[in-house]
């Protein structure tokens, strides 16, 4: 039998070899598919409910206007030409549907080294036959049950359309000291050959290394954080870790838009500088660490206040990070 693959919903024409190009013709189509109990015989005369599913064209070919899952099976044609020579055609029809692009849902933004983590769930909807999902790390296939990799798979079939939804949940245990930003992707491989795999957009979770951390110290000058108007406050974030982490600053719990720096200098202090300051150290190998908060206050405030008074010489300096 000749193998034929047809996309679900598309038309299909099967040629009846040896049949005269136009009537009168002596030919017969026999079908054994999901729509038939055993063999169903179709003749050029046609008619009846089968015409909407499959009908014989004037040239003897069999025409299926929209192939469905139930049309998978064997199609045979037996034709006799004008000289009485008999020719048989035999087709094995399989149908397919390519799903939408797979997606990774519930993806983790951060993984912890040394312990199992759920990376995400890969979902492919609307395939036929089911096909398979596979995971990749930095472009290379991940093998389940190897090196801390485990995959939980689930296949569901739509009760009406018969199309498949595949789900694959990936769990990994990142090695300590490994790649801090691994790239994971997932691909759908169709069940029928000659169709290329569909790949998700990659995800790049951070890997956090749980290391016993030494505390981040915040030193304030002048000590106590109380300063006269126009004075200068210097905040220094001391982190014992090597290499030096990136230091960012917070005021009243809100990040300050400043370039990273271990020192924050507040010259020409004014009332709007009052508040609670802390620093956040971000290491490449583990998560952010916040210091204690220190309060900056103004002692003996002068007349300076909103629009009733001015700051600094010709303009208060903007905050600098040293």
């Amino acid at each position: 039998a000749q193998n034929i693959t047809a996309r679900i919903g598309e038309p299909l024409v099967l040629k009846c070899k040896g049949a005269p190009k136009k009537p009168p013709q002596r030919l017969e189509w026999k079908l054994n598919t999901g729509r038939t109990e055993a063999w169903k015989v179709l003749s050029p005369q046609g008619g009846g409910p089968w015409d909407s599913v499959a009908r014989v064209l004037p040239n003897g070919s069999l025409f299926l206007p929209a192939v469905g899952i139930q049309d998978e099976g064997i199609f045979r044609c037996q034709a006799m030409n004008r000289n009485g020579k008999e020719t048989k055609s035999n087709y094995r029809v399989r149908v397919y549907q390519i799903p939408g692009k797979p997606e990774i849902v519930d993806s983790a933004s951060e993984l912890t080294a040394g312990v199992p983590n759920k990376v995400g769930t890969c979902v492919s909807e609307g395939s036929y036959p089911a096909g398979t999902l596979s995971w990749h790390l930095d472009g290379k296939p991940l093998v389940p049950n190897e090196k801390g990799v485990s995959v939980k798979e689930q296949t569901r079939r739509h009760p009406e359309t018969g199309l498949f939804t595949l789900q694959s949940e990936l769990m990994v245990t990142p090695a300590r000291g490994g790649d801090p930003r691994p790239t994971f992707s997932c691909s759908f491989s169709p069940g029928l050959p000659r169709h290329r795999a569909l790949r998700t957009a990659p995800i790049q979770p951070r890997v956090w290394e749980p290391v016993p951390l030494e505390e981040v110290q915040l030193v304030v000058e002048p000590e106590g954080g109380a300063v006269a108007p126009g004075g200068t406050v210097t905040l220094t974030c001391e982190v014992p870790a090597q290499p030096s982490p990136q230091i960012h600053w917070m005021k009243d719990g809100v990040p300050l838009p400043l370039p990273p720096s271990p020192v924050l200098i507040l010259p020409e202090i004014g009332p709007q500088d009052q508040g609670t300051y802390s620093c956040v150290a971000t290491h490449s190998s583990h998560g952010p660490q916040e210091s204690r908060a220190v309060s900056i206050s103004i002692i003996e405030p002068g007349e300076e206040g909103p629009t009733a008074g001015s700051v600094g010489g010709s303009g208060l300096g903007t905050l600098a990070l040293a």
Epitope: L258, P262, L266, P267, A320
Partner: antibody, heavy 116, light 107 residues
Framework: QVQLQQSGAELVRPGTSLKVSCKAS????????IEWVNQRPGQGLEWIGV????????HYNEKFKGKATLTADKSSSTAYMQLSSLTSDDSAIYFC???????????WGQGTSVTV | DIVMTQSQKFMSTSVGDRVSVTCKAS??????VAWYQQKPGQSPKSLIY???YRYSGVPDRFTGSGSGTDFTLTISNVQSEDLAEYFC?????????FGAGTKLELK
Amino acid sequence: QVQLQQSGAELVRPGTSLKVSCKASGYAFTNYLIEWVNQRPGQGLEWIGVINPGSGGTHYNEKFKGKATLTADKSSSTAYMQLSSLTSDDSAIYFCARSRAVRAMDYWGQGTSVTV
Amino acid sequence: DIVMTQSQKFMSTSVGDRVSVTCKASQNVGTNVAWYQQKPGQSPKSLIYSASYRYSGVPDRFTGSGSGTDFTLTISNVQSEDLAEYFCQQYNSYFFTFGAGTKLELK
């Protein structure tokens, strides 16, 4: 008094690079940030990025990443902005300005006109 | 990105008038807003920071107000030297953004 003195006007060919300087005086250079802003002919102001001269830390407007590189030399109290792969779209006046945390820009340079 | 909208591109005024230039932020920026004055061929001059604080040397006829998303620069008793373009700017979060400017002209 606080002053930010920028380098002079430049007329350059497309595809070339250019370094604009901003010399600070009258204050402690490392106590403040230096911001860079541009203004295309007849247009408004656009923030390019900021450098902390004390630490060398920088932050850029995404639009200018790869176009502008900010550096600072503490010994000469000078901030620099290098502009690369110049095109006619980069023709503008470039300003440096002093700023600090919790505050905006207070003093501005006189501007450097760049024509590509 | 936070968009700063100055809805009036031009405003007409007379010497001695009181005029208010407005600026609207697309999201809450607290009081992290500054106002700048720019005259043709000159660099911007800093007037107001933290929405309502005047820089030293700025005449007290310039007043800033507002918080959250709505900000106003008011010039009472407009002088001829105040005829210029005024820009608002947010410095609440990166990247910093400016309004498109409002030109103050004589009636």
